[in-house]
């Protein structure tokens, strides 16, 4: 028969016929034979592979340096690698965590519109109309201004983005 | 596409507690502000309470003591503490997706009902 | 604190008429207002916010306007499929409040 051109899904051609791949988490020792199957050995500890393959060595887990600000999220198997991510208060730099900043804290006059991950930063939002932040916060959200209606009072100084309004008693007029 | 479901709504007895869970998809609650609304049969919205992205929570000045609401990474909870037939209701949970601090629900669940008798 | 008062509580309208329905806030909300619709047995859905800003997918026919405290929602050429109750909601304060939302009007198309 016509060797083949192509193989099944989960093969590899070589020497013109059609091998198994190593399913993951093993590697290729030798190629199949006319006679022989292919043959494949797990990874050793701390090593992996997550596809069907033909690789002749397994990879590495990374390694969750902790003098970057890394700790390890998911302990890596046979079949998947290490995931790391950042200790509390730090974020990664990139989407495969290779090391890590500390979260940004929102300025005064901005509050936090949504809070760092171990993945993303701080997302800040100035503080609108009407609301207030007179902090540096990594967790606070804008405050809105007091309502000095509400207890009675008048305003005596207008409040800012960074200030909350100044509430008073209101003048009696005198009979 | 973002969607927010209700569950754990049953008739249950005066007093037994009961906690309602919302399961929330394609998206993040640290980004989400996420609120428990409530409608009685024939009545109009009923605002019960926020857990913002942040963690911090406030209630209706009304709902203080009666409710409590807590989140997990994908899930946010509301229990009623000591029910009565007054809390009878159709419990919306709805999702601010601007994370700021101005709240508009653009996100609602089809709702859970509770039923309170005895 | 910030007690939201709907009116009327129920209005008809003729098809191709126009509604107009008021929100009033017992104190300044700026113009951090929202407008929602619901048709029985469903949750509402988000039609204004921002006082006059449309909601994604909604129909030109709706319009939101006011700030402080006196807002108005305007329907206009009224379809049976406006049918429904109509509710404002403040989204400045959830600290010190009662219910963000306001009582609620229904609209009857005939």
């Known amino acids: 028969p016509e060797p083949p051109t192509a193989c099944r899904e989960k093969q590899y051609l070589i020497n013109s016929q059609c091998c198994s791949l190593c399913q993951p988490g093993q590697k290729l020792v030798s190629d199949c034979t006319e006679f022989t199957e292919t043959e494949c050995l797990p990874c050793g500890e701390s090593e992996f592979l997550d596809t069907w393959n033909r690789e002749t060595h397994c990879h590495q887990h990374k390694y969750c340096d902790p003098n970057l600000g890394l700790r390890v999220q998911q302990k890596g198997t046979s079949e998947t690698d290490t995931i790391c991510t950042c200790e509390e208060g730090w974020h990664c730099t990139s989407e495969a965590c290779e090391s890590c900043v500390l979260h940004r804290s929102c300025s005064p006059g901005f509050g936090v519109k949504q809070i760092a991950t171990g993945v993303s930063d701080t997302i800040c939002e100035p503080c609108p109309v009407g609301f207030f932040s007179n902090v540096s916060s990594a967790f606070e959200k804008c405050h809105p201004w007091t309502s000095c209606e509400t207890k009675d009072l008048v305003v005596q100084q207008a409040g800012t983005n960074k200030t909350d309004v100044v509430c008073g008693p209101q003048d009696r007029l005198r009979a | 596409c973002q969607s927010v479901e209700e569950s754990g709504g049953r008739l249950v007895t005066p007093g037994t507690p009961l906690t309602l869970n919302c399961t929330v998809s394609?998206?993040?609650?640290?980004?989400?502000?996420m609120n428990w609304v409530r409608q009685a049969p024939g009545k109009g919205l009923e605002w019960i309470g926020v857990i913002w992205n942040n963690g911090e929570i406030f209630y209706a000045s009304w709902a203080k003591g009666r409710f409590t609401i807590s989140k997990t990474s994908t899930t946010v909870d509301l229990k009623i503490t000591s029910p009565s037939t007054e809390d009878t209701a159709t419990y919306f949970c709805?999702?601010?997706?601007?994370?700021?601090?101005?709240?508009?629900?653009?996100?609602w669940g089809p709702g859970t009902l509770v039923t309170v008798s005895s | 604190a910030y007690d939201m008062t709907q009116t009327p509580a129920s209005v008809e309208v003729a098809v191709g008429g126009t509604v107009t329905i008021k929100c009033q806030a017992s104190?300044?909300?700026?113009?951090?207002l929202a407008w929602y619709l619901q048709k029985p047995g469903q949750p509402p859905k988000l039609l204004i916010y921002?006082?006059?800003k449309l909601a994604s997918g909604v129909s030109s026919r709706f319009e939101g306007s006011g700030s402080g405290t006196q807002f108005t929602l305007t329907i206009s050429g009224v379809q049976c499929d406006d049918a429904a109750t109509y509710y404002c909601?403040?989204?400045?304060?959830?600290?010190?409040?009662?219910?963000?939302f306001g009582g609620g009007t229904e609209v009857v198309v005939k």
């Open positions: 394609g998206f993040s609650l640290s980004s989400y502000d």
């Open positions: 104190q300044t909300i700026y113009t951090y």
């Open positions: 921002e006082a006059s």
């Open positions: 909601q403040q989204g400045y304060n959830s600290r010190h409040v009662d219910n963000v």
């Open positions: 709805a999702g601010d997706a601007d994370g700021g601090v101005v709240s508009y629900f653009h996100v």
